[in-house]
């Protein structure tokens, strides 16, 4: 049977650390971290760390019992936790039978928004007390609500991470731009800005509050050429105030309307 890992919390030092070992396994060859989305019973999503590691392909893995992973998180407060992943079988080969290094992973450290994490991992039995132990470490900074995975966090959803306003903006004439967008059930106040290098127009939008998405339209006066300008839509939801996720679009020319057929240049103009 191929070895797998069984992981569980281990807060203090590993018991092997107190023992003298003539030989110890080598260090890890690689350590990686990425956030993953997992569903929880409440129907909400939990964002966890997927920590994966690769074993060095040599005979020292015959001594390997476990790998210990510890994570320190630094944001508003500091957190620290460790797991010990025991190998279920002794290694009979230095590489997987199908080829490639032995690779394992553990999913389980919760990930908060915009937090710096320090992840350290070492093999067990580790080096003796007065020796430098082979270990691997890396820093991982979790992204914010714009990330394709983090956007599912409850805090991000309440800030509008899953809201797609589907902004369209077009230049009606030299003086006005029409902006259309889909509203969010999270709130009813929005600010639409038109800017090139500077702000050339803006408008507050207040829609009647309703618990469904509707299409809103606003015509914004502009002070200069607007074609190619950027539209920024800022929502003001109760949960995030003025710190909600902003969305952008680009001003294009409005399609011509009310012209049923192209003008025929040969036809005489009325009243001529």
């Amino acid at each position: 049977r191929e070895p797998t890992v069984q992981c569980g919390s281990e807060t203090g030092p590993s018991p092997e650390w107190m023992l003298q070992h003539d030989l110890t396994p080598g260090d890890l060859r690689d350590l990686r971290v990425e956030p993953v989305k997992t569903s929880v019973a409440t129907g909400d999503y939990s964002i966890l760390m997927n920590v994966s590691w690769v074993l060095r392909a040599d005979a020292s893995i015959r001594l390997l019992k476990a790998t210990k992973i510890c994570v320190t998180g630094k944001s508003n407060f500091q957190s620290y936790s460790c797991v010990r992943c025991n190998y279920t079988e002794a290694f009979q080969t230095q590489t997987r039978p199908s080829g490639g290094k032995w690779t394992f992973s553990y999913i389980g450290f919760p990930v908060e928004l915009n937090t710096v994490y320090f992840i350290g991992a070492h093999n067990i039995p580790n080096a003796n007390m007065n020796e430098d132990g082979p270990s691997m470490s890396l820093n991982f900074t979790s992204p914010g609500c714009l990330d394709h995975i983090m956007k599912y966090k409850k805090k991000c959803v309440k800030a509008g991470s899953l809201w797609d306003p589907n902004i369209t903006a077009c230049k009606k004439n030299e003086e006005t731009v029409e902006v259309n967008f889909t509203t969010s059930p999270l709130g009813n106040r929005y600010m639409a800005l038109i800017q090139h290098s500077t702000i050339i127009g803006f408008s507050q939008v207040s829609e009647p509050y309703q618990n469904k998405q509707t299409r809103a339209s606003v015509v914004i006066p502009v002070t200069e050429e607007s074609e190619g300008a950027m539209v920024q839509l800022t929502p003001y939801f109760p949960t995030c105030g003025s710190d909600c996720i902003r969305h952008k679009g680009t001003v294009v020319l409005c399609p011509q309307t009310g012209v049923p057929f192209p003008l025929d240049n040969n036809r005489s103009k009325p009243g001529g």
């Epitope: 030989l23 392909a57 040599d58 005979a59 020292s60 009979q92 080969t93 080829g99 490639g100 290094k101």
Partner: antibody, heavy 118, light 107 residues
Framework: QVQLVQSGAEVKKPGASVKVSCKAS????????MNWVRQAPGQGLEWMGR????????QYNQKFKDRVTMTRDTSISTAYMELSRLRSDDTAVYYC???????????WGQGTLVTVSS | DIQMTQSPSSLSASVGDRVTITCRAS??????LAWYQQKPGKAPKLLLY???NLADGVPSRFSGSGSGTDYTLTISSLQPEDFATYYC?????????FGGGTKVEIK
């Protein structure tokens, strides 16, 4: 059955390079490390390095690190060893040897004699 | 690097003799040791790995023992086809090194 077939004998001048090939058959090429071992005339065996055909990870003997290049082509199940800046004391038989479960050398090529002479 | 010291470097023996070759590692190699047989003009052939395990097709008159740093290859009853050079090799992590070899000659 497992077979490792090496390229033919080479005669090279000092300062030149030589590239030896080792074609594997009878097993899944990417599942085992391939080692290179050389033996000078009347001398013992010397490990030069190894390559993992799965991902091309290479570990060299420090003695050869600056002069040896190990590569592989998985499409034709072939490993290569190139030794540059040849000297007369590089005259030897060069063997490819496939690792077993760990790095004992379960299967060997027939050897390639490289003669370095001016 | 781990040094492998083999002794004797050569020996003379007769068919039917019991032959013992020793190999000492400069540090503990945790039984990660292999033995090879090589005949003139041929590639080495694996005899034993993990000290005691016989490779495929190797006769049972070959056996190995030892642990830590000291290891032994024994041929219980020497046969005519056994006259060759024998090498030990450690595989306790790269770089792998071989013993200097023991040439077994006909007395």
């Amino acid at each position: 059955q497992v077979q490792l077939v090496q390229s033919g004998a080479e005669v090279k001048k000092p300062g030149a390079s030589v590239k030896v090939s080792c074609k594997a058959s009878g097993y899944t090429f990417i599942s085992y490390w391939m080692n290179w071992v050389r033996q000078a005339p009347g001398q013992g065996l010397e490990w030069m390095g190894r390559i993992d055909p799965y991902d091309s990870e290479i570990q060299y003997n420090q003695k050869f690190k600056d002069r040896v290049t190990m590569t592989r082509d998985t499409s034709i199940s072939t490993a290569y060893m190139e030794l540059s800046r040849l000297r007369s004391d590089d005259t030897a038989v060069y063997y490819c040897a496939r690792s077993g479960g760990f790095d004992w050398f379960a299967y060997w090529g027939q050897g390639t004699l490289v003669t370095v002479s001016s | 690097d781990i040094q492998m010291t083999q002794s004797p470097s050569s020996l003379s023996a007769s068919v039917g003799d019991r032959v013992t070759i020793t190999c000492r590692a400069s540090e503990n190699i945790n039984s990660n040791l292999a033995w090879y047989q090589q005949k003139p003009g041929k590639a080495p052939k694996l005899l034993l790995y993990d000290v005691t395990n016989l490779a495929d097709g190797v006769p049972s008159r070959f056996s190995g023992s030892g642990s830590g740093t000291d290891y032994t290859l024994t041929i219980s009853s020497l046969q005519p086809e056994d006259f060759a050079t024998y090498y030990c090799q450690h595989f306790w992590g790269p770089p792998y090194t071989f013993g200097g070899g023991t040439k077994v000659e006909i007395k």
